[in-house]
Amino acid sequence: IFKKEQAMCLEKIQRANELMGFNDSSPGCPGMWDNITCWKPAHVGEMVLVSCPELFRIFNPDQVWETETIGESDFGDSNSLDLSDMGVVSRNCTEDGWSEPFPHYFDACGFDEYESET
C-alpha cells in the first residue's frame, strides 16, 4: 500500500512543480513523501496542513474525525483544513527547509512513522 501511495505522491509532486513553476533551484520547500503522507511543494513562509492519512483509520477504528479527501486538485483543498480540527498535522516551509511535523503524527494521529514502515 505504501509503495503505491509513495508512487502516487511523487507523480502529484511532479505535476505540482510544473503548475507552480518549481525546479531544483527554486527557493522554497520541495514536495515530499515522508513515509506517512504526501506534502505539496511550498514557498518559504507557507504553512502546509494535511489530515491524518485515511489508511490509519483501519489501524485506529476509534478515530472519528472527518479526514480531508483528495478532490480534483492533487493535494485536495488544504485551505479547508484548520489546525483547530483534530487529526491535522502541519509543517512550515522555512529558509532551512521543512520544519518537523506539528503535532507529531503519534500525538495527532495515534501512529508512528515506524508503523508505516512495516
Partner: antibody
C-alpha cells in the same frame, strides 16, 4: 481488567537515583496500541507528566524537557513491566509517582493508573 | 510547553447543584483535552476524553465541551461521591501538561 502495580523505595537520598517499577497485568508492555507513562504529583508542581515508552516495531521514549537529562524509562518484556529511573535527585523531586497506561481513541489519554508511590528525597 | 489554567481553584457546592469548571490552554489544542477526577490518597480517574466524550462507566451527569483554548467540565446534579479535585490535561503535544486542579467541596 488492566491493573498496574507499583513498587520501589519510598525514601531516596539527595544525589542518588530514584528507581520505581510498574508491573502490568491484563495488558502487555509490548502492546502496539498502548503507551506506558510516568507522572508525578507534588503540592508545589501539581501533576507533572514525566515521560512514556511504547513499542511500534521498535521501542521509543518521549521525556519531559524538565527531567530529560536525568530520566530513563525502560520496558522489561520478560516481566511485562516498565521502570522509572531518575538520577541526581534533590528534595524538589519529592512527590507521589504514578505509572499509567496511555490509550488512543481520537487522542491519547491515561485510562489506567498505578496506586501511586510517595517518594521522599531526604538525607 | 503548553500551559493549562483552571478556574475556579476551589468551589463549594451542595448535593443536587449543577457546577461548571473551566480550563484554558495557552495555545489552541483543538479538542485534545481530557478531564480527570482525583480523590484524596487515590490516583486520578479519567472522566472525559477528546473534550466531550464520556469514558466508559462514567455517569452521564458528567459532560465536557469546548475546542481550541477554552473548555468546560459540567456536573449536573452533584452527588456526594463527586466531591473531589478535577484536573484537565492536554495531549496535543508533549509534555502533556495538566491544569492545577479545581477542588469541589461541600457547602
Amino acid at each position: 481488567q488492566v491493573q498496574l502495580q507499583q513498587s520501589g523505595p519510598g525514601l531516596v537520598k539527595p544525589s542518588q537515583t530514584l528507581s520505581l517499577t510498574c508491573a502490568i497485568s491484563g495488558d502487555s508492555v509490548s502492546s502496539n496500541s498502548a503507551t506506558w507513562n510516568w507522572i508525578r504529583q507534588s503540592p508545589s508542581r501539581g501533576l507533572e507528566w514525566l515521560g512514556r515508552t511504547y513499542y511500534r516495531s521498535k521501542w521509543s521514549n518521549h521525556y519531559a524537557v524538565s527531567v530529560k537529562s536525568r530520566i530513563t524509562i525502560n520496558p522489561d518484556t520478560s516481566k511485562s513491566q516498565f521502570s522509572l529511573q531518575l538520577n541526581s535527585v534533590t528534595p524538589e523531586d519529592t512527590a507521589v509517582y504514578y505509572c499509567a497506561r496511555g490509550t488512543w481513541k481520537q487522542l491519547w489519554f491515561l485510562d489506567h493508573w498505578g496506586q501511586g508511590t510517595l517518594v521522599t528525597v531526604s538525607s | 510547553d503548553i500551559q493549562m489554567t483552571q478556574s475556579p481553584s476551589s468551589l463549594s457546592a451542595s448535593v443536587g447543584d449543577r457546577i461548571t469548571i473551566t480550563c484554558r490552554a495557552s495555545q489552541s489544542i483543538s479538542r485534545y483535552l481530557n478531564w480527570y477526577q482525583q480523590k484524596p490518597g487515590k490516583a486520578p480517574k479519567l472522566l472525559i476524553y477528546a473534550a466531550s466524550s464520556l469514558q466508559s462507566g462514567i455517569p452521564s451527569r458528567f459532560s465536557g465541551s469546548g475546542s481550541g483554548t477554552d473548555f468546560t467540565l459540567t456536573i449536573n446534579s452533584l452527588q456526594p461521591e463527586d466531591f473531589a479535585t478535577y484536573f484537565c490535561q492536554q495531549s496535543y503535544s508533549p509534555p502533556f501538561t495538566f491544569g492545577p486542579g479545581t477542588k469541589v467541596d461541600i457547602k
